[in-house]
């Protein structure tokens, strides 16, 4: 079995990949220019911090998080950290375009870096679902299309329904999850006898895996609170996410265990349910009122995301192909729509609070913004599937699905691994 | 005691700059969003600019964006309004304000609690 | 952009009047509406926010209510000082917006 690259993907990779990053740059070199009014250079430190975690929580914690295939786990460090820088390009351009343009040039500043990179992390989380079923050259075309849909569902939320960065960008778990299941659905799904052991989790990449969750779950506070605008918003989105991670972590360990007949722990639940309070409270972080509230939501989010894990596998992979370790996009559907419906729970309580009688419109508002992102990442993610079928792109054959040694030269091993 | 102390203000010629600036003294300037607001002579009050308390966002009204850009330094608790290409409709008092969030029963709303005294911008050929 | 319309424009009363402000927004803001009062030669200052919290230190004759898209600033009883101009100012959206003021005189 040669390592190889197939001879036409070697030559249509390096040209797609170069001649979009040629193309990047000349828009770069024609239509941007950075902030040139920074006073304050320590301000301008501690501000670069956000972008900083953000940055660890993509290429270390959603990087490894999906490493934990026993032979697909190189690819899965690699090829998150392209889609990463890749997305993180075509953000900047993307919301500069649709946001600044008409006033002259797109202005990078921090803040632009730091919405780019939460924009790349959307398909971070999204691709999990095809991982290992597709070849660079395809993941390409997911970063340029989901990154424009996210862009594009952003820009017009905010139009329509004047929503801020914080809320228009923490549909991201319900659009990423919804693109990535789409997509997936559109792939070739039977996997042909005798690769079944490609899918399965091994214990170094598991670990790894772990060291993942790890990092995305030090840095979820981070995440949740970089979009809010005045310091006590983001105090209690920090504090929030803090508590809600907390108790999903005793919660998936506990819960990992209560649902195995012999009382064990599956890693594979761990890795995903540890996260879950993140994503539930995301979008109502900064509002909960109270720490014992955010913690209930984590309680429910890591109770929810373990049974998930436990029944929806059998499910997904006959029905989408998505093997049963990658979890994240069944778990951050069903955890985005549990915060989105806490957030509109918070909504008609502070309206009925405020006894001005705006219940139904409220509610309506949120539930149409939710439905746009649902109907946006299914659109957009059913396009891409049916892009990443084109015969154009050399998918991998399906008997080579999984496998590191299609696309990486480990010179140890001559065949097999 | 909390202040906001504008200066730079002046009569300049039209397409010319211009740049004010706004002293914060009695409270912690770092946690607070500051706003440029203007006020025409015999007009109303017209928002100018807003940053955000860490400077990473800014924002600006549409007759503005392109010509003003808004800054600040936290370490010297100042606020700047730079101000580009001149116009003669840009003859105002320019106010500095700091910007509140307060909570509602769940939500936080946002207002300018405390202003500047104003600097008055003259632009005449 | 978010536009504000007051009305009146100006209105005349006496000391001890009840005195009734409107401010109609183009789209709706939930509660997110501020007053300000303006007094010749000054700068402004905030007297209600989030539609109808009275901020601190201002007199408890001034109240504020309405939501959505429809706001009311009521002075219950007119005193010499309240004689100034009163702004409504949304700051729903990012780029926020003022009314073009009520001038309360004295008749």
């Known amino acids: 079995m040669s390592s190889k690259y197939p001879r036409s993907v070697r030559r249509c990779l390096p040209l797609w990949a170069l001649t979009l990053e040629a193309a990047l740059i000349l828009l770069f070199y024609f239509f941007t220019h950075y902030d040139a009014s920074l006073e304050d250079q320590k301000g301008l430190v501690a501000s670069y911090q956000v972008g900083q975690d953000l940055t660890v929580m993509a290429a270390i914690g959603l990087g490894f998080l999906t490493s934990s295939f026993r032979r697909h786990s190189w690819s899965s460090v690699a090829f998150n950290l392209f889609m990463l820088a890749l997305g993180v390009q075509w953000a900047i351009l993307l919301d500069g375009f649709l946001s600044q343009f008409p006033s002259g040039k797109v202005v990078i500043t921090l803040f632009s870096i730091r919405l780019a990179t939460m924009s790349a992390l959307s398909v971070l989380i999204s691709v999990d679902a095809v991982l290992g079923k597709v070849n660079l050259a395809q993941l390409v075309v997911m970063v340029l299309v989901e990154v424009t849909a996210l862009g594009n569902l952003r820009m017009v939320i905010s139009n329509i329904f004047n929503t801020d960065y914080h809320m228009n960008m923490m549909h991201i778990y319900v659009f990423a999850a919804y693109f990535g299941l789409s997509v997936a659905w559109c792939l070739p799904k039977p996997l042909p006898e005798g690769t079944e052991d490609k899918d399965q989790t091994a214990t170094i990449p598991s670990l790894s895996a772990m060291l993942g969750a790890l990092f995305l779950w030090m840095f979820w506070p981070s995440f949740n609170s970089a979009l809010l605008r005045s310091p006590i918003e983001r105090k209690n989105a920090v504090f929030n996410t803090y508590y809600a991670v907390a108790v999903s972590v005793v919660t998936a360990i506990s819960g990992s265990s209560l649902a195995h007949p012999q009382g064990k722990i599956s890693k594979t639940y761990v890795h995903s349910a540890v996260l879950a309070g993140g994503v539930a409270v995301g979008t109502s972080c900064h509002l909960i009122p109270s720490p014992w509230l955010a913690m209930v939501l984590g309680l429910v989010a890591g109770l929810i995301s373990v049974g998930g894990a436990k029944y929806l596998p059998g499910c997904c992979n006959r029905v989408l192909g998505i093997p049963h370790s990658s979890i994240m996009g069944y778990n951050f559907s069903l955890l985005g729509l549990l915060g989105e419906i806490i957030y509109i729970v918070l909504l008609v309580l502070d309206t009925v609070g405020a006894g001005n009688g705006m219940i139904g419109f409220q509610v309506l508002l949120s539930i149409g913004e939710l439905s746009l992102a649902i109907v946006i990442a299914l659109m957009s993610g059913l396009l891409t599937g049916l892009l990443l079928n084109l015969k154009i792109w050399k998918a991998p054959h399906e008997a080579k699905y999984f496998d590191d040694q299609v696309f990486w030269k480990f010179p140890h091993l001559a065949v097999g691994f | 005691e909390v202040q906001l102390v504008e200066s730079g203000g002046g009569v300049v010629q039209p397409g010319r700059s211009l740049r004010l600036s706004c002293a914060a003294s009695g409270f912690t300037f770092n946690t607070y969003g500051m706003h440029w607001v203007r006020q025409a002579p015999g007009k109303g009050l017209e928002w100018v600019a807003v940053?955000?308390?860490?400077?990473?966002?800014?924002y600006y009204a549409d007759s503005v964006k392109g010509r003003f850009t808004i800054s600040r330094d936290n370490s010297k608790n100042t606020l700047y309004l730079q101000m580009n290409s001149l116009r003669a409709e840009d003859t105002a008092v320019y106010y500095c304000?700091?910007?509140?969030?307060?909570?509602?029963?769940?939500?936080?709303?946002?207002?300018?609690?405390?202003w500047g005294q104003g600097t008055t911008v003259t632009v005449s050929s | 952009d978010i536009q504000m319309t007051q009305s009146p424009s100006s209105l005349s009363a006496s000391v001890g009047d009840r005195v009734t402000i409107t401010c109609r927004a183009s789209q709706s803001i939930s509660s997110y509406l501020n007053w300000y009062q303006q007094k010749p030669g000054k700068a402004p200052k905030l007297l209600i926010y989030?539609?109808?919290s009275l901020q601190s230190g201002v007199p408890s004759r001034f109240s504020g209510s309405g939501s959505g898209i429809d706001f009311t600033l009521t002075i219950s009883s007119l005193q010499p000082e309240d004689f100034a101009t009163y702004y409504c100012?949304?700051?729903?959206?990012?780029?926020?917006?003022f009314g073009q003021g009520t001038k309360v005189e004295i008749k």
């Open positions: 100012q949304q700051s729903y959206t990012t780029l926020w917006t």
């Open positions: 940053i955000w308390y860490d400077g990473s966002n800014k």
């Open positions: 304000a700091r910007e509140v969030a307060v909570r509602g029963v769940i939500r936080y709303y946002y207002a300018m609690d405390v």
């Open positions: 989030a539609a109808s």
